[in-house]
Amino acid sequence: MEKDKHSHFYNQKSDFRIEHSMLEELENKLIHSRKTERAKIQQQLAKIHNNVKKLQHQLKDVKPTPDFVEKLREMMEEIENAINTFKEEQRLIYEELIKEEKTTNNELSAISRKIDTWALGNSETEKAFRAISSKVPVDKVTPSTLPEEVLDFEKFLQQTGGRQGAWDDYDHQNFVKVRNKHKGKPTFMEEVLEHLPGKTQDEVQQHEKWYQKFLALEERKKESIQIWKTKKQQKREEIFKLKEKADNTPVLFHNKQEDNQKQKEEQRKKQKLAVEAWKKQKSIEMSMKCASQLKEEEEKEKKHQKERQRQFKLKLLLESYTQQKKEQEEFLRLEKEIREKAEKAEKRKNAADEISRFQERDLHKLELKILDRQAKEDEKSQKQRRLAKLKEKVENNVSRDPSRLYKPTKGWEERTKKIGPTGSGPLLHIPHRAIPTWRQGIQRRV
């Protein structure tokens, strides 16, 4: 679409320089405002998304304290308010856009009809159109001469939300792109759903039905315009032939004044008919508008009802969740209390056991100490007894004899007895060492 628009614009640029520059400026403004709005929306969504994420973190370690519950409530309220504000803003923007779209559609329809009338209409229609166009706004004219198919198509567009079937431009373009890629095969549904995460399968199917009808009606419209054009051409040719014939026949002179009078009368009749037709069309349009408004309001009410129900459900869900959490916390607290009590009792029992064990151990130690001391004392007394016995053995009464000091000892006396008279007689025999057996047979060389 963008490509087509650019090629069309740039081809015509030199012919409509002023108009083109104005449109270009307008387009740039629109692009800028669209980008700004997109950034703002993304920012709002990011904030909501982040707050939801933070709420997840908070819910991870729930504490049953009033402060914590209050903080949680604040976070939830903040998220809820952000969502509601965002939705309200979007609703207002959307309503404004729908209004603009309707106005634009009406204008386009009028221009389109005007062009179709130029393409199809005979000179009478053109005259009638010109006559009432000075008194009536352009977009309200619906020439009865338009083919039925054209009117059907226009009516269809009006009733179903314009050339995008009440979808926004981005979603519809994506839908068409994917559909064309798959050449309309049913497999394209999956990819459309991937591309448009905001749409349900049911919505896409409905849109597909609408689009099929749209294509069929558009095709019929094109065909009927083509037929009209052909017929028009034929009519023109016939008139031209008749005119040629008339030129060749002799002219009958009428009363000029009478002729003029008749012409004016006819003109007035035609104008009257045209105005009546326009009034009729206007009343039809008005009744249709009323009906669509009524329908719209009903839809809106339904939506509000749905939203209220959703909010109520959400509230109930949150309440039940909080209640559940509370109950869970209470249960956990009781469980913890019971566990702690049991642990305390166990500890007390263990402590008592330990004390009695320590007491037993201390008694045992004391006994051992006493036994040890007793053993040591027994040993001591035994030692003393032994020493006393030894003393008894050693203590013999010996009489003192000082003269003994000068007498030789018995040992000395014995020794003197053995040695004979001293002298240096010849040595008759010198003892030799024994000869080893292995040398006993060998004679010694002198």
Epitope: L45, A46, H49, N50, V52, K53, K54, Q56, H57, L59, K60, P197
Partner: antibody, heavy 114, light 107 residues
Framework: QVQLQQSGPELVKPGASVKIPCKTS????????IDWVKQGLGESLEWIGD????????MYNQKFKGKATLTVDKSSNTAYMELRSLTSEDTAVYYC???????WGQGTLVTVSA | DIQMNQSPSSMFASLGERVTITCRAS??????LSWIQRKPGKSPKTLIY???RLVDGVPSRFSGSGSGQDYSLTISSLEYEDMGIYYC?????????FGGGTKLEIK
């Protein structure tokens, strides 16, 4: 216990796409967002985006918009990241993580090579 | 986007030493900050979340502190297995952003 299981390494051609799964277990899938992180070769860590499994809401790092698409399949408790129009710049290890980044998947190495 | 300025970018420390890494955010991040450890060939491991909460199973020698814009990670007594790259991560706002990392090596 909490586990985030990722698939094995992927070798893909430039211009192609790849879809990395992150199968979770041990906790309620819809309770926490799933975050995705890129670790380029010899580079720092980069946050790609996250998805809320409850309603499928996503948030992307501007740098990865148009490159990565995050989705979830609640029936199998699995999060997915699809990477499109791959180039050598996308060669990296991709991790999924959740719950304040306390739990991480083991990572999937994606190699883009002709 | 929120910028996370991490320092130092690399450091050497001895076993048993007390180590501190700091991170400064370009705006208040309301303690939505994690400290992540990365080792070659392994998945990142979160040590601290919400600025000062220790992840289950992480040794108590690791601790985190800070608020507003300034945060720090402290290892009270460095051990051999603490070698690796440490990142801070803010998740207060989108997009979530990581610090540049601190490479910690043993002297």
């Amino acid at each position: 216990q909490v586990q985030l299981q990722q698939s094995g390494p992927e070798l893909v051609k430039p211009g192609a796409s790849v879809k990395i799964p992150c199968k979770t277990s041990g906790y309620s899938f819809t309770d926490y967002n799933i975050d995705w992180v890129k670790q380029g070769l010899g580079e720092s860590l980069e946050w790609i985006g996250d998805i809320n499994p409850n309603y499928g809401g996503t948030m992307y790092n501007q740098k990865f918009k148009g490159k990565a698409t995050l989705t979830v399949d609640k029936s199998s408790n699995t999060a997915y990241m699809e990477l499109r129009s791959l180039t050598s710049e996308d060669t990296a290890v991709y991790y999924c993580a959740h719950d304040e980044f306390i739990y991480w998947g083991q990572g999937t190495l994606v190699t883009v090579s002709a | 986007d929120i910028q996370m300025n991490q320092s130092p970018s690399s450091m050497f420390a001895s076993l048993g030493e007390r180590v501190t890494i700091t991170c400064r955010a370009s705006q208040d991040i309301n303690t939505y900050l994690s400290w992540i450890q990365r080792k070659p060939g392994k998945s990142p491991k979160t040590l601290i979340y919400r600025a000062n909460r220790l992840v289950d199973g992480v040794p108590s020698r690791f601790s985190g502190s800070g608020s507003g814009q300034d945060y720090s990670l402290t290892i009270s007594s460095l051990e051999y297995e603490d070698m690796g790259i440490y990142y801070c991560l803010q998740y207060d706002e989108f997009p979530h952003t990581f610090g540049g990392g601190t490479k910690l090596e043993i002297k």
